[in-house]
């Protein structure tokens, strides 16, 4: 607010006032009169820049008059009282109400005193963020979508992620005239490593006390990525039972595991138990390539592992033996 005048009467008002679409707003405006100064106010006037005539007048004897009586009201001025507060309330704010307004006091003996106020009409946007479920494409595709609906002015959308990615932001008119819907897509080449990771959409707007953060959990659909664990190249005759595990990462989850060998079905010493393969003790050396084939809704992938059971001192190793 401008500082009060030192020796003269001064009109005090904020340079800018925000108001929300459809709501009411008060344009504050006061006459500041220094202690030793004498002034008499006979009229309060509000006018909008670029429009002919005044929109509201409070006259010392005629009282208030308005260009739109249902939408305007002097909040403090009263007949028979000192006219020092010209604050004006506007109801049912519309987009077209945004603009510059002049608040004016007709005073004696100083003459007219006025100040300009910028009325900013805001609309608070509604924000949503959602995942765009994708498959492996090898090309950059939208993986997350953030929408700020019905903001005035348009909201600012930014993305925060350790994964890289590029935003693609667009605007369209909102449902209410003068409002804007902002849509931002977060674009990246899909990979299995990204599946399940988070990205954050940050929406900033004049009407927010602080930015809104919306987290999106990414979804990438991909066929199984398969490996076999549990073998350390040190299996010997006489060792205890051992277990191999078919490790599969996929989205959606695997629907089936199938164990086999390069020669066909499993040998008798290998017993399939879903994702695991139980290797029973053997009494002669073997050299077999095992295959784990994993299926999900997107397809099947397999991993191979060559297992050797060698002769050697069982006492020195964890074993495959009958005990």
């Amino acid at each position: 607010w401008p500082p009060p005048g030192t020796g003269d009467v001064v009109v005090q008002a904020p340079t800018q006032v925000p108001g929300f679409l459809g709501d009411s707003v008060t344009l504050p405006c006061y006459l500041q009169v220094p202690n030793m100064e004498v002034t008499h106010v006979s009229q309060l006037t509000w006018a909008r820049h670029g429009e002919s005539g005044s929109m509201a007048v409070f006259h010392q004897t005629q009282g208030p008059s308005y260009s739109e009586s249902k939408r305007l009201e002097f909040v403090a001025a009263r007949l028979g009282a000192e006219l020092r507060n010209a604050s004006l309330r506007m109801f049912g704010l519309r987009v077209e109400d945004e603009g510059n307004y002049t608040c004016l006091f007709v005073t004696f003996p100083q003459g007219s005193r006025s100040v300009d106020i910028w009325l900013r009409v805001l609309a608070k946007p509604q924000n949503t963020a959602e995942v765009q479920k994708v498959q492996l494409t090898g090309e950059p595709v939208p993986m997350a979508r953030c929408v700020s609906t019905g903001g005035r002015p348009p909201a600012q959308i930014t993305w925060h992620s350790d994964l890289g990615g590029m935003p693609n932001t667009s605007q369209v008119p909102g449902f209410l005239s003068g409002t804007v819907t902002v849509t931002s897509l977060w674009i990246l080449v899909p990979s299995s490593q990204v599946d399940g990771k988070n990205v954050t959409c940050k929406v900033e707007h004049e009407s927010f006390e602080k930015p809104q953060l919306l987290t999106v959990n990414l979804t990438v659909y991909y066929p199984p990525e398969v490996s076999i664990s549990g073998y350390d190249n040190n299996w010997y005759l006489g060792q205890n039972e051992a277990t191999l595990t078919c490790d599969a990462r996929s989205n959606p989850e695997p629907t089936g595991y199938n164990w086999s060998t390069t020669m066909g079905p499993l040998p008798p010493f290998a017993v399939a138990q879903g994702a695991q393969l139980l290797i029973r003790p053997v009494d002669k050396p073997i050299n077999t390539t095992l295959i784990c084939n994993v299926t999900n809704a997107l397809g099947a992938r397999q991993a191979e592992l060559t297992v050797q059971v060698k002769e050697g001192p069982p006492s020195e190793h964890s074993g495959i033996s009958r005990n």
Partner: antibody
Framework: EVQLVQSGSELKKPGASVKVSCKTS????????MHWVRQPHGKGLEWIGG????????SYNQRFKGRVTITVDKSTSTAYMELSSLRSEDTAVYYC?????????WGQGTLVTVSS | DIQMTQSPSAMSASVGDRVTITCKAS??????VAWYQQKPGQPPKALIY???YRYSGVPDRFSGSGSGTDFTLTISSLQAEDLAEYFC?????????FGQGTKLEIK
């Protein structure tokens, strides 16, 4: 009912002074500024000056500065306008008028004739 | 000082006519303009304040418009009793100034 009743016509010689009164009724005298406006015969209106009865604060048209004095008597709710060093071009009807930014009530007018 | 230039200075119109009187200020006066009617031998009577607001009791055939430097007083349907002189006045800044008047005659 608001009323502003002015004193009667005056005939004055050049160089003399005239004091016109304006007695008010029907409203609170101290709540409104009182002004004076003159109108030469067949001509337009000219603002002379005004006074706030409460504090006695005045404002004058520079054209009359030094020659005009506006005063009030709060006890009788009366305003006065005195114009000195009269010349023939000061011949006019002098009105008191209650100020509301514009002038909403006027006295009936006082004809002041300056002639040798 | 702000000059208020009124036109026309005199005009004649018939009962029922629409009459327009204009007033041009030499500088921006916002909406701080009043219009007065003065009948012969009487003091002026306030019709319009703040450029476009009618005083209570003033017939609605009288209307004012404008802001800035250009102002208009309109009588939508002239009546015989509207025979008078009309003045505009600015009260944006001191000294207050008036237009030179428009004398309206009835044909």
């Amino acid at each position: 009912e608001v009323q502003l009743v002015q004193s009667g016509s005056e005939l004055k010689k050049p160089g003399a002074s005239v004091k016109v009164s304006c007695k008010t009724s029907g409203y609170t005298f101290t709540e409104y500024t009182m002004h004076w406006v003159r109108q030469p015969h067949g001509k337009g209106l000219e603002w002379i000056g005004g006074i706030h009865p409460n504090q006695g604060e005045t404002s004058y048209n520079q054209r009359f500065k030094g020659r005009v004095t506006i005063t009030v008597d709060k006890s009788t709710s009366t305003a006065y306008m005195e114009l000195s060093s009269l010349r023939s071009e000061d011949t006019a009807v002098y009105y008191c008028a209650r100020w509301t930014g514009d002038f909403d009530y006027w006295g009936q007018g006082t004809l002041v004739t300056v002639s040798s | 000082d702000i000059q208020m230039t009124q036109s026309p200075s005199a005009m004649s119109a018939s009962v029922g006519d629409r009459v327009t009187i204009t007033c041009k200020a030499s500088q921006n006066v916002g909406t701080n303009v009043a219009w007065y009617q003065q009948k012969p031998g009487q003091p002026p009577k306030a019709l319009i304040y703040s450029a476009s607001y009618r005083y209570s009791g003033v017939p609605d055939r009288f209307s004012g418009s404008g802001s800035g430097t250009d102002f208009t007083l309109t009588i939508s349907s002239l009546q015989a009793e509207d025979l008078a002189e009309y003045f505009c006045q600015q009260y944006e800044s001191y000294p207050y100034t008036f237009g030179q008047g428009t004398k309206l005659e009835i044909k």
